[in-house]
């Protein structure tokens, strides 16, 4: 659901954080359409999600938290 | 609908532990986030910390972590929270509460009924 | 450890509309939706507006609520006896303390 850079919509699956080693930030204000959440799998894929929905802010604060201890 | 019905009234000594059980019925375990919130005698509301089953992770308010435990038993469909090295301010009401996690809210729609878990020597 | 500020009480007669004021910051209201909840002593907490505005199936419409910037409130029309219980503001908040944050609570009474 993404268009170059930009997402253009969201998944409607639920990602397991276990596939996920990153995130990416996308801001409605900064060229692209929607707010989004990024998520890079290990697969490298890039998924689209709703930074609304409480899984996806799981994940980012999970995503977060290991950073930080790092 | 789903129901949240929790474990009994609990007392224990300082320094020891308590763990809460909160059973769900009526609905599938899949894609719900249960959490725990706590309210102590002329307090307010206190979210403890949250997991979501299918993910099999929790998340704890910094003001717990180290000192609780939240797990899930999906086929029992049963979410716990272990509270450990108890302490007298620890005494107050503990609520499981659901979050529908596919939504685009994260608001507590259903709780249980509560469980007093009292500290005192 | 609450962060998110409101007046300890509020009163109205009945028939009055009160307002309950919650204040936060960028990182929980200021990018978060707002939920409100009504607890009355010795019961579960009740969910009575979600995501700033949004009344669950139940609640009557004399309650709604709004956002704007890092505050949000909760407004009761057309008072009632009933409502006489403790109102929290609750929201995500996106720093690492605690990502589910409450308000400090508003004993509303209804003289």
């Known amino acids: 659901a993404s268009n170059f850079d930009c997402c253009l919509g969201y998944t409607d699956r639920i990602l397991h954080p276990k596939f996920i080693v990153g995130f990416t930030r996308q801001l409605a204000n900064e060229g692209c359409d929607i707010n989004a959440i990024i998520f890079h799998t290990k697969k490298k894929l890039s998924v689209c999600a709703n930074p609304k929905q409480t899984w996806v802010k799981y994940i980012v604060r999970l995503l977060s938290k290991k950073v930080k201890n790092m | 609908q789903m129901q949240l019905v929790q474990s009994g009234a609990e007392v224990r000594k300082p320094g020891s532990s308590v763990k809460v059980s909160c059973k769900a019925s009526g609905d599938t375990f899949n894609n719900f986030a249960i959490s725990w919130v706590r309210q102590a005698p002329g307090h307010g509301l206190e979210w403890v910390g949250g997991?979501?089953?299918?993910?099999?992770?929790?998340d704890y308010a910094q003001n717990f972590t180290g000192r609780v435990t939240i797990s899930a038993d999906k086929a029992t469909k049963t979410v716990y929270m272990e509270l450990r090295s108890l302490r007298y301010d620890d005494t107050a009401v503990y609520f499981c509460?659901?979050?529908?996690?596919?939504?685009?809210?994260?608001?507590?729609?259903?709780w249980g009924q509560g469980t007093m878990v009292t500290v005192s020597s | 450890q609450s962060v998110l500020t409101q007046p300890p009480s509020a009163s109205g007669t009945p028939g009055q509309r009160v307002t309950i004021s919650c204040s936060g910051s960028s990182s929980n209201i200021g990018s978060n939706t707002v939920n409100w909840y009504q607890h009355l002593p010795g019961t579960a907490p009740k969910l009575l507006i979600y995501s700033n505005n949004q009344r669950p199936s139940g609640v009557p419409d004399r309650f709604s609520g709004s956002k704007s910037g890092t505050s949000a409130s909760l407004a009761i029309s057309g008072l009632q006896s009933e409502d006489e219980a403790d109102y929290y503001c609750a929201a995500w908040d996106d720093s690492l303390n605690g990502p589910y944050v409450f308000g400090t609570g508003t004993k509303l009474t209804v003289l």
């Open positions: 997991i979501i089953p299918v993910f099999n992770t929790a």
């Open positions: 509460a659901r979050t529908k996690i596919e939504l685009d809210n994260d608001a507590f729609d259903i």
